[in-house]
Interface confidence: medium
C-alpha cells in the first residue's frame, strides 16, 4: 500500500501528523489564537507535546530568526498557575526556562534565549510572532 503524506496549507510545514504555521506578525496572545482559528482546519496556537516536536519546531524557526520570542498555545486562564493547552491537549511535557513565573504573566512563549527549546511566561497583551498548529 502507498501511504500518502497529508499536505499542509501553503506556507505551513508538516511534522508527524501535524501542520505548523509560523507567522511573523505581531499579535497579542488572544488575537494570535483568533488568527490561528481563522485559518480553519481546527487550527489553534500550537501545543508542544514532546522534545522531538519542540526540536523540529525550533529548528524550523531558527531558519527565519533567532531573537524574537513566539507565542504558543499554553496559557493560564484562571491566573492560578494552572497551565493548559488551548487546543485541549494534555499538559504533560513541560519545558519551562528557569525564569520566574510570577507577575501578570499568564501566556507562554518559546524563548529565543535557548534556541526556542524552552518556554517563558509573559504578559498576554504583549504582541509577538506566533505559531499555529492543526492536524490535516
Amino acid at each position: 500500500d502507498i501511504i500518502m503524506r497529508p499536505s499542509c496549507a501553503p506556507g505551513w510545514f508538516y511534522h508527524k501528523s501535524n501542520c505548523y504555521g509560523y507567522f511573523r506578525k505581531l499579535r497579542n496572545w488572544s488575537d494570535a489564537e483568533l488568527e490561528c482559528q481563522s485559518y480553519g482546519n481546527g487550527a489553534h496556537l500550537a501545543s508542544i507535546l514532546s522534545l522531538k516536536e519542540a526540536s523540529t519546531i525550533a529548528e524550523y524557526i531558527s531558519g527565519y530568526q533567532r531573537s524574537q520570542p513566539i507565542w504558543i498555545g499554553l496559557h493560564d486562564p484562571q491566573k492560578r498557575q494552572q497551565w493548559q493547552w488551548i487546543d485541549g491537549a494534555m499538559y504533560l511535557y513541560r519545558s519551562w526556562s528557569g525564569k520566574s513565573m510570577g507577575g501578570n504573566k499568564h501566556c507562554a512563549e518559546m524563548s529565543s534565549n535557548n534556541n526556542f527549546l524552552t518556554w517563558s511566561s509573559n504578559e498576554c497583551n504583549k504582541r509577538q510572532h506566533f505559531l499555529c498548529k492543526y492536524r490535516p
Epitope: 511573523r24 506578525k25 505581531l26 499579535r27 497579542n28 488572544s30 488575537d31 483568533l34 488568527e35 524574537q68 504578559e123 497583551n125 504582541r127 510572532h129
Partner: antibody
C-alpha cells in the same frame, strides 16, 4: 490610499467624557491585521500615546491613562472610537487617530494619521 | 515626562548635516526598535524612520537613523528649508509597558 477622518465635539466640560471617532476609508478596518491607535499632543508639548485597538476588539491602554480610557471598534461602519472619562483642563490637546504600519518586527509604527482634532476642556 | 530625552533644539545652514540624538535606557531603546517622526506646525506627524534605520517609501535618503546601546540618532544631510520642523523619536518601554515618544527637537534651518 488609506485615509483617517476624525469626528467629535471640540469642547467638553470638566468631569465629562471626551468622545472621538475615527472613520477609515480606502481599506477595511478588519483586514490586513492592523492595530489602530489614539495619540494626543498637549498644547506646545510632545506626543503621548493613549492606546490601541484591534478589529477583534482587543485593546491595550497606556497605563497612566488606563483607568479613564475606553476604545471600541465598529467594523460595519469601518470606524473606531475613543472615550476618555472624567476629563480636566489637563486633557486639553490635539487628538490624533493613527494606523500602524503592520510589519513583521516593528510595533507601534504609525504610517497613517488623521488630521487631528483640537479638544478643549472648559466649563 | 518622557524618559526618551532629545535636545530641545538644533540648527544648521541649508546644505549642511545635522544629527538629532535620542537618549533612553535598556528597557526602551536598548531592547526595542526606534522610529522617528517629523511634525510641521499644525500638521499631523509623519513617519520618517522605523526599525532604527528603515525609510518608508517617499522619504528622501537624506534622512537616516542609527542606534548604539541605549541611544538613537537621526541624521539629516543636505538640509533643505522644508526640513524645518519638530522631530520625535519613539520606542516601546518594556519596564513601563507603554509606548514612548521623545521630548521632541525643533530643527531650524538657518
Amino acid at each position: 490610499q488609506v485615509q483617517l477622518q476624525q469626528s467629535g465635539p471640540r469642547l467638553v466640560k470638566p468631569s465629562q467624557t471626551l468622545s472621538l471617532t475615527c472613520t477609515v476609508s480606502g481599506g477595511s478596518i478588519s483586514r490586513g491585521g492592523y492595530y489602530w491607535s489614539w495619540i494626543r499632543q498637549l498644547p506646545g508639548k510632545g506626543l503621548e500615546w493613549i492606546g490601541y485597538i484591534y478589529h477583534s476588539g482587543s485593546t491595550y491602554y497606556n497605563p497612566p491613562l488606563k483607568s479613564r480610557v475606553t476604545m471600541s471598534v465598529d467594523t460595519s461602519k469601518n470606524q473606531f472610537s475613543l472615550n476618555l472619562s472624567s476629563v480636566t483642563a489637563a486633557d486639553t490637546a490635539v487628538y490624533y487617530c493613527a494606523r500602524e504600519k503592520g510589519g513583521d518586527w516593528e510595533q507601534l509604527v504609525f504610517d497613517h494619521w488623521g488630521r487631528g482634532t483640537m479638544v478643549t476642556v472648559s466649563s | 515626562q518622557s524618559v526618551l530625552t532629545q535636545p530641545p533644539s538644533v540648527s544648521a545652514a541649508p546644505g549642511q548635516k545635522v544629527t538629532i540624538s535620542c537618549s533612553g535606557s535598556t528597557s526602551n531603546i536598548g531592547n526595542n526598535y526606534v522610529s522617528w517622526y517629523q511634525q510641521h506646525p499644525g500638521k499631523a506627524p509623519k513617519l520618517m524612520i522605523y526599525d532604527v534605520s528603515k525609510r518608508p517609501s517617499g522619504v528622501p535618503d537624506r534622512f537616516s537613523g542609527s542606534k548604539s546601546g541605549n541611544s538613537a540618532s537621526l541624521d539629516i544631510s543636505g538640509l533643505q528649508s522644508e526640513d524645518e520642523a519638530d522631530y520625535y523619536c519613539a520606542a516601546w518601554d518594556d519596564s513601563l509597558s507603554e509606548f514612548l515618544f521623545g521630548t521632541g527637537t525643533k530643527l531650524t534651518v538657518l
